[in-house]
């Protein structure tokens, strides 16, 4: 498991662009946090490259990432979550590039789930609900959610609604009758923690009733 490159490899390495980006996920597996990094250039030869994080850790000064295909990954309880860590790309003992990062500013929440839409006939509206694992978490509890919906035939015409709760009401009159809609939701940290949008939830599909038609619950298609 030698971490060493030949001299020629090191010279070549210095010509490459080793820009990388990372995101953290807190309490992603019980009390374990994760940190995922990847090179921005997908063509970088990663054969001898390793990632290392030093500083702002509990009990240890440095930890090394596991390599999983094109990404580098750590799962641990040992992030201090106070102050900046130094994340470096290494060939052997040589650091090629480093970034000082506060892991609380690169948080990517887990995707929301259990998205559903129920039509309320009497109210002439649709109640959108979804769930998020972050309601049970100690750290990243407060999120902003982005609900996006579109008529299925409108390829890129998404309507977005931002909300902090996990429930949204859509008025029937704002939607086309007898139409198929796709809806999805994602989340971003909204208090103390900063970072990136989560992945989108799986999409949910529902049909609006025809005018003067009573449908009751909107079944998924």
């Amino acid at each position: 498991e030698s971490g060493y490159a030949q001299n020629g490899d090191l010279e070549d390495a210095e010509l490459d662009d080793y820009s990388f980006s990372c995101y953290s996920q807190l309490e992603v597996n019980g009390s374990q946090h994760s940190l995922t990094c990847a090179f921005e250039d997908p063509d970088v030869n990663i054969t001898n490259l390793e990632f290392e994080i030093c500083g702002a850790l509990v009990e240890v000064k440095c930890l090394n990432f596991r390599k999983l295909q094109e990404i580098y990954f750590i799962e641990t309880k040992k992030f201090l979550l106070i102050g900046k860590s130094n994340i470096c790309v290494k060939v052997g003992e040589k650091s090629l590039t480093c970034k000082k990062i506060d892991l609380t500013t690169i948080v990517k929440p887990e995707a929301p789930f259990d998205l559903s839409v129920v039509y309320r006939e009497g109210a002439n509206d649709f109640v959108v609900t979804f769930n998020t694992s972050h309601l049970q978490k100690k750290y990243v509890k407060v999120l902003m959610h982005d609900v996006a919906y579109r008529q299925e035939k409108d390829e890129n015409k998404w309507t977005h609604v931002n909300l902090s709760s996990t429930k949204l009401t859509l008025l029937q009159r704002k939607l086309q009758p007898a139409a198929m809609y796709e809806i999805k939701v994602r989340s971003i940290p909204d208090h103390y923690f900063k970072g990136f949008w989560s992945e989108w939830s799986p999409s949910y599909y529902f049909r609006t009733p025809e005018i003067n038609n009573s449908s009751g619950e909107m079944d998924p298609i």
Epitope: E1, S2, G3, Y4, E50, E52, C54, V58, E59, V60, K61, C62, L63, N64, I74, T76, K77, K78, C88, K90, G92, E93, S95
Partner: antibody, heavy 116, light 106 residues
Framework: QVQLKESGPGLVQPSQTLSLTCTVS????????IAWIRQSPGKGLEWMGV???????DYNSAIRSRLSISRDSSKSQVFLRMNSLQSEDTAMYFC??????????WGQGVVVTVSS | EIVLTQSPTTMAASPGEKVTITCRAS?????MHWFQQKSGSSPKPWIY???DLASGVPDRFSGSGSGTSYSLTISSMEAEDAATYYC?????????FGGGTKLELK
């Protein structure tokens, strides 16, 4: 599999310098943290110091002035040097990996006796 | 430095008996780690991060605690558990070990 093996002289004269080597296999030293621990009947287990994957070192303040830990990654070796040895430095010396969760891999240890 | 005090220093237990070893820290620590050592061998990681069992450790062992008080428990003593157990803190420098608890089979 991961293996650590300590080597060095079994007998050291008082006031002399102890040099021990920890030879590691199954691990890349630039990606791992290696600590030295000793065990004596009088003092039990004592953590001496560590060399981190980035080359930084931390030492037990009680022996910092006498201790140096270094490595040669190309040979997969970590070195401990401690000077001004006295009889109370007689102990079994271990190297171990400072893993993410604990001291997870240990060598078999080497006995060092300080005596004239 | 953080002083770890283990109790008892020595004890004997009969097969099937429940055993509890405690480790008290002079200051609060994030996690406690436990090692098992048998005569002539190096210490083996036994419990890490206060409550997680190391690979191959029987599930009759458990660890618990927080702050300054931690414990290792054997739900039902077996002959192979006779050994010396040490606690370790890595929360501050220098890392320190407890003085050990020698557990013998009655």
């Amino acid at each position: 599999q991961v293996q650590l093996k300590e080597s060095g002289p079994g007998l050291v004269q008082p006031s002399q310098t102890l040099s021990l080597t920890c030879t590691v296999s199954g691990l890349s030293l630039p990606n791992n943290n290696i600590a030295w621990i000793r065990q004596s009947p009088g003092k039990g287990l004592e953590w001496m110091g560590v060399i981190w994957s980035n080359g930084d070192t931390d030492y037990n303040s009680a022996i910092r002035s006498r201790l140096s830990i270094s490595r040669d990654s190309s040979k997969s070796q970590v070195f401990l040097r401690m000077n001004s040895l006295q009889s109370e430095d007689t102990a079994m010396y271990f190297c171990a990996r400072e893993g993410m969760t604990t001291l997870d891999y240990w060598g078999q240890g080497v006995v060092v006796t300080v005596s004239s | 430095e953080i002083v770890l005090t283990q109790s008892p220093t020595t004890m004997a237990a009969s097969p099937g008996e429940k055993v509890t070893i405690t480790c008290r820290a002079s200051s609060s620590v994030s996690y406690m780690h436990w090692f098992q050592q048998k005569s002539g061998s190096s210490p083996k990681p036994w419990i890490y991060d206060s409550s997680d069992l190391a690979s191959g450790v029987p599930d009759r062992f458990s660890g618990s605690g927080s702050g300054t008080s931690y414990s290792l428990t054997i739900s039902s003593m077996e002959a192979e558990d006779a050994a010396t157990y040490y606690c370790l803190q890595r929360s501050s420098y220098p890392r320190t070990f407890g003085g050990g608890t020698k557990l013998e089979l009655k």
